[in-house]
């Protein structure tokens, strides 16, 4: 169902000293700036709904500009316990205390807050990102080293009056920016406690939050300029699938990848892509300003509604998955990467997908909802779309049940 | 400016293995993925395969499976092609280049000679 | 795989001439044809890409047509820092082939 409800206290329509307070671009992430101890530190950090942990970088590393120095804060106090994050590529590690912590381009509020200051990385910080730290916005369930370990936003809720919720408005550029662009480039917003109206057009659409760990949610139909994938909806959710702002493409199961890259490369046959273009390998170029936006299929998401039998859908235009490119030796033209991927841990909803919505993360009612974004890039001919209701049976089926590891089974 | 620089000219022993490097500079590093290239006189240039740097997914051309290994560090912007039970064969230049539309970048060409 | 054949080992040219390089692909390719230019002793430089578009740099003496199955890299005003062997390439699908390359000399 749209927002049509009376208001609740803390989430009145404008949040000015929050607008425009992300920087960054899809393929590096969007960050934004935060305080750390006393006397402040001032901190970059990426604003990411796929994890759980505040971590920022505590040591000299070459990719860093900065970092927290928690011998310089008075407030800092140490836990005394280490944490170790693995990525399938990558890792970090450091040690867990926790120190003053606010936004300033967010609520006028300071917490004391868990944080990681990390020690010791690989393949995590990228160089020319901007950023030096993650905020984890996620829940407790997949914070590390355990969920006993209090994610940033619970900190946050819990010690001030700030309402349990918080939207992103994330701004994809529809071209490349160079360095100095990016830094001087608004990347968009995070609202935290509230909905800004000024962000959005049209209405807002609720999905259920299937499980509190990730944000996960439950797909339960994928069309292709119209036409339905027809897959058992069971393929879309293998093994979830969630809403991630710290990914860049729009990831999908194996299955689902090669059927929608089928029926996305019988939509544009009008032009021959190399192979290594739907693998994101090789880019396309077209002379500048001539990009074919119009041979390349919209790509539509229905999500499960609030309501029993009742879906919505949401709608993506090739400006959000042909994601732009700066290379030198083709500089004269506008290349672009193909960036929807494959993956092996379900479907990712990242910022291809979340650069066309204003996507509002009600934890107080476990949901998630999804509006066309007033920032979105688009053509005079097509633009991005939340639309319902629509009809969808037996939608619970959709959702994937992951075998549990009953561990008192295992020997010890 | 882009630049990719291989690794000094390696002389092996037949049955040894060898690891040359490329090291990228100028770019964002995990943008673009690095393929590596064997050219032997009268032989032409031949694509052994290439890495993303951004997940280290791998993808060999079927001839040089068994032969070559791909891996990247980001920290140091490095990819590395590991060669192994070196034959004459193997002997040739060997080339790092850079994706972007086919291969717009060229590393500066790494001697492999094997040689008892 | 597909078969890049450049049926011409090498071509004779003057200085200030027009000569043409050409490359038959063994199945359709689309436009996703590169050309490189090598030098002995020298890594290949990047000529032309999508058979017609030319890299940054590149003079516009090099000029590259052809989609399908054909392909041909036209150098006019031959110069003498042209003198060097030519490759085709295609990148429209895995594994990445190339020509057997063209060697251009002087008359």
């Known amino acids: 169902e749209t927002d049509e409800e009376p208001e609740e206290p803390g989430r009145r329509g404008s949040f000015v000293e929050m607008v425009d307070n992300l920087r960054g671009k899809s393929g590096q992430g969007y960050y934004v700036e935060m305080t750390v101890g006393s006397p402040p530190q001032t901190l970059n950090i990426l604003v990411d709904t796929g994890s759980s942990n505040f971590a920022v970088g505590a040591a000299p590393h070459p990719f860093l500009h900065r970092y927290y120095q928690r011998q310089l804060s008075s407030t800092y106090r140490d836990l005394r316990k280490g944490v170790y994050v693995p990525y399938t590529q990558g890792k970090w590690e450091g040690e867990l205390g926790t120190d003053l912590v606010s936004i300033p381009h967010g609520p006028n509020v300071t917490v004391r807050a868990n944080i990681a200051a990390i020690t010791e990385s690989d393949k995590f910080f990228i160089n020319g990102s901007n950023w030096e730290g993650i905020l984890g916005l996620a829940y407790a369930e997949i914070a590390r080293p355990d969920d006993s370990l209090e994610p940033f936003f619970d900190s946050l809720v819990k010690q001030t009056h700030v309402p349990n919720l918080f939207s992103l408005q994330l701004c994809g550029a529809g071209f490349p920016l160079n360095q100095s662009e990016v830094l001087a480039s608004v990347g968009g917003s995070m609202i935290i406690g509230g909905i800004d109206h000024s962000l959005y057009t049209g209405s807002l659409w609720y999905t259920p939050i299937r499980r509190e760990w990730y944000y996960e949610v439950i797909i339960v139909r994928v069309e292709i300029n119209g036409q339905d994938l027809k897959m058992d909806c069971k393929e879309y959710n293998y093994d979830k699938s969630i809403v991630d702002s710290g990914t860049t493409n729009l990831r999908l199961p194996k299955k689902v990848f090669e059927a929608a890259v089928k029926s996305i490369k019988a939509a544009s046959s009008t032009e021959k892509f190399p192979d290594g273009f739907w693998l994101g390998e090789q880019l396309v170029c077209w002379q500048a300003g001539t990009t074919p936006w119009n041979i390349f299929p919209v790509i539509s998401l229905y999500l499960m509604g609030e309501v029993t039998n009742q879906s919505f859908r949401i709608t993506i235009l090739p400006q959000q998955y042909l994601r732009p490119v700066e290379d030198v030796a083709t500089s004269q033209d506008d290349c672009y990467k193909f960036a929807i991927s494959q993956s092996s841990t379900g479907t990712v909803m990242g910022a291809v997908i979340m650069e066309g919505f204003y996507v509002v993360f009600d934890r107080a009612r476990k949901r998630i909802g999804f509006a066309v974004s007033a920032c979105h890039v688009h053509d005079e001919f097509r633009t991005a779309a939340v639309e319902g209701p629509f009809v969808t049976l037996d939608m619970e089926d959709c959702g994937y049940n992951i075998p549990q590891t009953d561990e008192s089974t295992l020997m010890t | 400016e882009v630049q990719l620089q291989q690794s000094g000219p390696e002389l092996v022993k037949p049955g040894a293995s060898v690891k040359l490097s490329c090291k990228a500079s100028?770019?964002?590093?995990?943008n673009f993925w690095i393929h590596w290239l064997k050219q032997r006189p009268g032989q032409g240039l031949e694509w052994?395969?290439?890495?993303?740097?951004?997940?280290?997914?791998?993808k060999y051309n079927q001839k040089f499976k068994a032969k070559a290994t791909l891996t990247v560090d980001t920290s140091s912007s490095t990819t590395y092609m590991h060669l192994s039970s070196l034959t004459s064969e193997d002997s040739a230049v060997y080339y790092c280049?850079?994706?972007?539309?086919?291969?717009?970048?060229w590393g500066q060409r790494t001697l492999v000679t094997v040689s008892a | 795989d597909i078969q890049m054949t450049q049926s011409q080992k090498f071509m004779s040219t003057s200085i200030g001439d027009r000569v043409s390089v050409t490359c038959k692909a063994s199945q359709n390719v689309g436009t996703n044809v590169a050309w490189y230019q090598q030098k002995p002793g020298q890594s290949p430089k990047s000529l032309i890409y999508?058979?017609?578009h030319w890299y940054s740099g590149v003079p516009d003496r090099f000029t590259g047509s052809g989609s399908g199955t054909d392909f041909t890299l036209t150098i006019s005003n031959v110069q003498s820092e042209d003198l060097a062997e030519y490759f085709c390439?295609?990148?429209?699908?895995?594994?990445?082939?190339f020509g057997g390359g063209t060697k251009l000399e002087i008359k």
């Open positions: 100028g770019y964002t590093f995990t």
């Open positions: 999508s058979a017609s």
């Open positions: 390439q295609q990148y429209n699908s895995y594994p990445y082939t």
């Open positions: 052994i395969g290439m890495i993303d740097p951004s997940d280290s997914y791998t």
């Open positions: 280049a850079r994706s972007g539309v086919a291969f717009p970048y």
